[in-house]
Interface confidence: low
């Protein structure tokens, strides 16, 4: 017959026949031959491969270095590769988490538009006209000023982005 | 022969203050992460800090924060741990260990012989 | 925090397997080490990273750790393997020891 030229899902062409790929989590030890399977082994400790393949290595599992600031958000198996992720307070600087850095703080005059997470940074927003915020913060949101009518005073000192209005008793009028 | 020694314990009365130190010898010292450990008489291991290789992550159990401050000398190869505000539950033999690799997952592979701290009046 | 808990004690009569149990919450999601202590000496590593023995320590300990549950195994146990055993793991920026499990070899 005549040999085949392409090979069906999950086979690979060598030596002009099909063979079967290795399944997830195991590499490739010996081509098919005429007579033979293809010939595969299950990946060792701290090695995956995660899709169906010839390779004749397995991928080593990622570290996730603590000295980084990293640490295993999920452990790898013989078919997946370990997930890092970042320690409280920090986030990773790219899609593949490599290393970590620490959450950017809003100046005052900025309130926290949105808490970062173990991957996107802290987003600040410049505080509206009525709010204020007079510190350096990962977590806090603009204030609003407060309202010195509420409690019986008038403002004495008006407020700003980064400081709150300063409220005082009222002028009575003398008899 | 990779080691660690241990000095610095003593008798301290409460509320005082103590300098640990922990020599090491027989590997490269910055490239390991190192910890202090301790062990109250009759007790369990209770880990008290750790530092990382480069010296610019410290992390502490909640018992001691505040109050103990994990440092290394690359120049000395030595470890120290100053404790502040001592109490009598700071009372243990006091362990330096070394990671066991990059991996902070190796455990500690190297332990020093211990030095005892005593919290008393 | 986080916790790991040991059964305070176990027997085993020698040249029997001896396990001992370290349990935590979603446990299989990190790596968990293993510690000998004997009286009067300072602690030695015997499983690391789950499962793996460093160079020294001999074949018949082994680790496994899935689930809420790390297990260290020691077959055909010996009189010199009896001894205070303690899991750790490294969690969020800290590290925690299990309270230990005194072996003792009958």
């Known amino acids: 017959p005549e040999p085949p030229t392409a090979c069906r899902e999950k086979q690979y062409l060598i030596n002009s026949q099909c063979c079967s790929l290795c399944q997830p989590g195991q590499k490739l030890v010996s081509d098919c031959t005429e007579f033979t399977e293809t010939e595969c082994l299950p990946c060792g400790e701290s090695e995956f491969l995660d899709t169906w393949n010839r390779e004749t290595h397995c991928h080593q599992h990622k570290y996730c270095d603590p000295n980084l600031g990293l640490r295993v958000q999920q452990k790898g198996t013989s078919e997946t590769d370990t997930i890092c992720t970042c320690e409280e307070g920090w986030h990773c600087t790219s899609e593949a988490c490599e290393s970590c850095v620490l959450h950017r703080s809003c100046s005052p005059g900025f309130g926290v538009k949105q808490i970062a997470t173990g991957v996107s940074d802290t987003i600040c927003e410049p505080c509206p006209v009525g709010f204020f915020s007079n510190v350096s913060s990962a977590f806090e949101k603009c204030h609003p000023w407060t309202s010195c009518e509420t409690k019986d005073l008038v403002v004495q000192q008006a407020g700003t982005n980064k400081t709150d209005v300063v409220c005082g008793p009222q002028d009575r009028l003398r008899a | 022969e990779v080691q660690l020694v241990e000095s610095g314990g003593g008798l301290v009365q409460p509320g005082g203050s103590l300098r640990l130190s922990c020599a090491a010898s027989?590997?490269?010292?910055?490239?390991?992460?190192m910890s202090w450990v301790r062990q109250a008489p009759g007790k369990g291991l209770e880990w008290v800090s750790v530092?990382?290789?480069?010296?610019?992550?410290?992390y502490y159990a909640d018992s001691v924060k505040g109050r103990f401050t994990i440092s290394r000398d690359y120049s000395k190869n030595t470890l120290y741990l100053q404790m502040n505000s001592l109490r009598a539950e700071d009372t243990a033999v006091y362990y330096c260990?070394?990671?066991?690799?990059?991996?902070?997952?190796?455990?500690?592979?190297?332990w020093g012989q211990g030095t005892t701290v005593t919290v008393s009046s | 925090s986080y916790e790991l808990t040991q059964p305070p004690s176990v027997s085993v009569s020698p040249g029997q397997t001896a396990s001992i149990i370290c349990s935590g919450d979603?446990?299989?999601?990190?790596?968990v080490c293993w510690y000998q202590q004997k009286p009067g000496q300072s602690p030695v590593v015997v499983i690391y990273?789950?499962?793996k023995r460093p160079s020294g320590i001999p074949e018949r300990f082994s680790g496994s750790n899935s689930g809420n549950t790390a297990t260290l195994t020691i077959s055909g146990t010996q009189a010199m393997d009896e001894a205070d055993y303690y899991c750790?793991?490294?969690?969020?920026?800290?590290?925690?020891f299990g309270g230990g499990t005194k072996l003792t070899v009958l």
């Open positions: 260990a070394k990671e066991g690799g990059d991996y902070y997952y190796y455990g500690m592979d190297v």
């Open positions: 027989g590997f490269t010292f910055g490239s390991y992460a």
């Open positions: 530092i990382s290789d480069s010296g610019g992550r410290t």
């Open positions: 979603k446990l299989g999601d990190k790596y």
């Open positions: 990273h789950d499962n």
């Open positions: 750790q793991v490294w969690d969020s920026s800290t590290v925690v």
